[in-house]
């Protein structure tokens, strides 16, 4: 045992660069940290066989394997990864320690599995055994958290049933609307999945994971706030657990809180009372309602009432599937240069939407805002005047939705010319699309003002960059305009652009361009 | 370097819920299989083991303390928690936290690095 | 369960003596055996692991052996840094359990 070497096996994570194949290498690239392996004798092998902790890196990523070896004299060593043999370069590092390294870039199924070391020390040999998966990421969920009632106790636990499974964490706030952004003072985080702080103004609780983070808002009817003008709205699937809670302050303890579903008291078990004195001996009241898994006929008008309060009512519906209404009529847009401008969709789901907005193939972030109608908006204004297709996509466990819009960026035409031997060719993007005017400069008209109108062929949109039209015209060449030089103008209401081009023989050509506003 | 560094409150009153940390650095909860325990030991006394989680996201709990025990990991943060709640004098000891490899061919080399510890007492 | 009975509670040895450490599981734990030192105010330092096999680092003068039930752990000659509390581990399977350990002090 005295004469086996001191081994460290580490692993090092790069930031992706573009390459191909496992390779060893001395020299890897600049890279995060090393992480320790835990390299250990691994017991009962034939042989010396060292062993690091299993390795599980993303699709693509680019990692390095690395023994550091503390022995005596030189070492030789040799990789072997699915039955081939890889070249191996050690090399001493400060420390005066033998360094043997694995590259493996762009991480691929087929570079996923053993790799083997075998090193030759002056005292000993030895193996050392590296284990390389791909996490997979497609058994990955993350679902929206819910509430349950800590038995015994006037608390609430949150539920998300997510894999890895999730850090759960309650988001609270006691400001009113803008201040309860998430990054506001005003909020406060607690992580941990029993809450026993259920006076608060804004409860959410956020489950998140490698997916991502989801929250859920407890649905709250405060009878000292002004009513919203729209009845406030619940949406849950059957099956789904329904929590409401009603909130209500007095200078007093004399006020009784009660819960009617349709004019009928809500049935013993299905709602729970608390109480507290705030820090200026007001008393507050919440009296939750509650239905562990609700059926159809719990939809209804839920009406919280307090004896020293005007009533409140939410309306809950329940759905047998999931929905998101929007309408998905495709929407075309004429906006200037610099006009401030974004994209809206107005809509109502449940489940909450997942969302993107698309331009070019690219993807941006989507936010969604709440309104007090029930409706959501989402908001698109990164467009960075460029026309073209914008796309809304929208999905939720049960339903998806695509919204099509179309920018046009009103402007004045930018002529574009090219010729060959039998035809020349001009094209323009500008917005409205342009008309075409063909002109003949000679001597008898040196300002170009002979109008051609033989051989002239338009077309409004003979190409689609990212749905931007761009408008083309074609001059047929004949004998009569040979040799000359012909204009080629396109106008709307915005302007005039000119290219002026020479008709000889095939060939690169001299233009001119002209702009006329 | 590898460390596990234990966090949490000193001092916690009876019926109280404990909560530690258990932030680790110098090898990855994400990229590398490693599970992590915690134990604790009280003054003058052995070590007592009291819960696990596996790179899996698998844990596993004492018998005697499973209902009053929650362990969880943020791989995020590089930290693995621990709940144990209903706080009595007897739970007075040093926590340590604790890392195990986990070996692709299945055996298990125990615990190779452990935190330095963090002293909590409970007392009203 | 598994219970581990570690035997002696307490051993006064001196320096350059041969000490042995015994641990016994309730049931078998096939070689799934740690060793761990631990010094006051200190955390438990690993020594053995897999019943024989020796921690990188640590002095060859330690050592271990046993398969099954049965497990001991032999200091060849005792160096004055020895002398510490000593646990035994079964890290066979869940839930894991620790020795109630040996007290190593100096006669």
């Known amino acids: 045992n005295q004469d086996l070497p001191v081994i460290k096996c580490v692993l090092i994570n790069h930031k992706n660069n573009d390459s191909s194949v496992g390779k060893s290498s001395s020299y890897p690239m600049v890279s995060e940290s090393p992480e320790d392996l835990g390299c250990a004798l691994r017991p009962q092998s034939s042989g010396t066989v060292y062993e690091a902790a299993a390795v599980e890196v993303d699709v693509s990523a680019s990692i390095t394997l690395q023994v550091l070896v503390d022995a005596p004299g030189n070492i030789s060593c040799l990789w072997v990864f699915k039955h081939s043999s890889l070249n191996c370069q050690p090399h001493f590092d400060l420390q005066n320690r033998g360094v043997v390294s694995m590259v493996i870039l762009k991480m691929t199924e087929t570079q996923a599995g053993e790799y083997l070391l075998f090193i030759q020390s002056e005292a000993t040999n030895y193996t050392i055994l590296f284990t390389v998966s791909i996490r997979n990421t497609l058994l990955y969920t993350l679902r929206r958290p819910y509430f349950r009632k800590m038995e015994n106790q006037d608390a609430l636990v949150c539920i998300s049933e997510s894999v890895p499974e999730p850090i759960v964490e309650w988001v609270l706030c006691d400001s009113q609307g803008e201040s309860c952004k998430e990054e506001s003072p005003a909020v406060v985080k607690k992580e941990e999945k029993v809450l026993h702080e259920l006076f608060g103004t804004d409860i959410r609780c956020c489950a998140r994971n490698e997916l991502g983070r989801e929250c859920t808002r407890l649905f709250t009817i405060d009878l000292n706030q002004t009513p919203q003008t729209t009845l406030p709205q619940l949406f849950l699937k059957v099956g789904e657990p329904l929590w409401i809670r009603c909130k209500a302050v007095h200078v007093n303890h004399g006020f009784g809180l009660t819960w009617e579903l349709e004019n009928k008291a809500l049935e013993e078990g299905n709602y729970f009372e608390m109480s507290t004195y705030s820090t200026n001996r007001t008393m507050i009241r919440i009296l939750f309602a509650f239905v562990s898994s609700v059926a159809r006929n719990d939809t209804g008008y839920y009406t919280c009432s307090s004896s020293k309060h005007p009533s409140q009512s939410a309306l809950v519906t329940i759905v047998e599937k999931g929905f998101i209404n929007a309408t998905n009529s495709s929407e075309d847009y004429e906006i200037d240069q610099y006009e401030e401008f974004c994209f809206s969709v107005r809509f109502k789901a449940y489940p909450q939407i997942r969302c993107t907005w698309t331009f070019s193939r690219k993807s941006f972030p989507c936010e969604q805002k709440g309104l007090d109608n029930g409706y959501s908006i989402s908001k698109f204004c990164n467009h960075k005047h460029q026309p073209g297709e914008y796309i809304f996509h929208a999905e939720n466990d049960d339903a998806q939705f695509t919204k099509m819009f179309t920018l046009n960026i009103r402007r004045k035409p930018q002529v574009l010319a090219e010729a060959s031997a039998s035809q020349a060719s001009c094209f323009s993007d500008g917005y409205p699309l342009p008309s075409w005017t063909w002109k003949k400069c000679s001597d008898k008209s040196p300002n170009c003002t002979e109008e051609i109108t033989e051989g002239v062929w338009n077309r409004k949109a003979n190409r689609k960059v990212f749905g931007q039209w761009v408008s083309s015209s074609t001059l047929n060449m004949s004998e009569a305009i040979k040799g000359f030089l012909v204009k080629c103008c396109a106008y709307n209401s915005l302007g005039t652009s000119c290219e002026t081009i020479l008709l000889n023989s095939p060939g690169p050509f001299p233009f001119i361009q002209d702009n006329i506003s | 370097q590898v460390t596990l560094k234990e966090s949490g409150p000193v001092l916690v009153k009876p019926t109280e819920t404990l909560t530690l940390t258990c932030t680790v650095s110098?090898?990855?909860?994400?990229?590398?299989?490693?599970?992590v325990s915690w134990i604790r030991q009280p003054p003058g006394k052995a070590l007592e083991w009291l819960a696990h989680i596996f790179s899996n996201d698998e844990k596993s709990y004492s018998t005697s303390l499973k209902s009053r025990l929650t362990i969880s990991k943020d791989t995020s943060k590089s930290q693995v928690v621990l709940t144990l709640t209903n706080m009595d004098p007897v739970d007075t000891a040093t926590y340590f936290c604790?890392?195990?490899?986990?070996?692709?061919?299945?055996?298990?080399?125990?615990?190779?690095?452990w935190g330095q510890g963090t002293m909590v007492t409970v007392s009203s | 369960d598994i219970q581990m009975t570690q035997s002696p509670s307490s051993l006064s040895a001196s320096v350059g003596d041969r000490v042995t450490i015994t641990c016994r599981a309730s049931q078998d734990i096939s070689n799934y055996l740690a060793w761990y030192q631990q010094k006051p105010g200190k955390a438990p330092k690993r020594l053995i692991y897999a019943a024989s096999s020796l921690q990188s680092g640590v002095p060859s003068r330690f050592s271990g052996s046993g398969s099954g039930t049965e497990f001991t752990l032999t200091i060849s000659s005792l160096q004055p840094e020895d002398f510490a509390t000593y646990y035994c581990?079964?890290?066979?399977?869940?839930?894991?359990?620790f020795g109630g350990g040996t007290k190593l002090e100096i006669k």
């Open positions: 110098g090898f990855s909860l994400r990229n590398i299989k490693m599970g």
């Open positions: 604790a890392r195990m490899p986990e070996y692709s061919s299945g055996w298990s080399g125990a615990f190779d690095i």
């Open positions: 581990l079964q890290h066979n399977s869940f839930p894991l359990t």
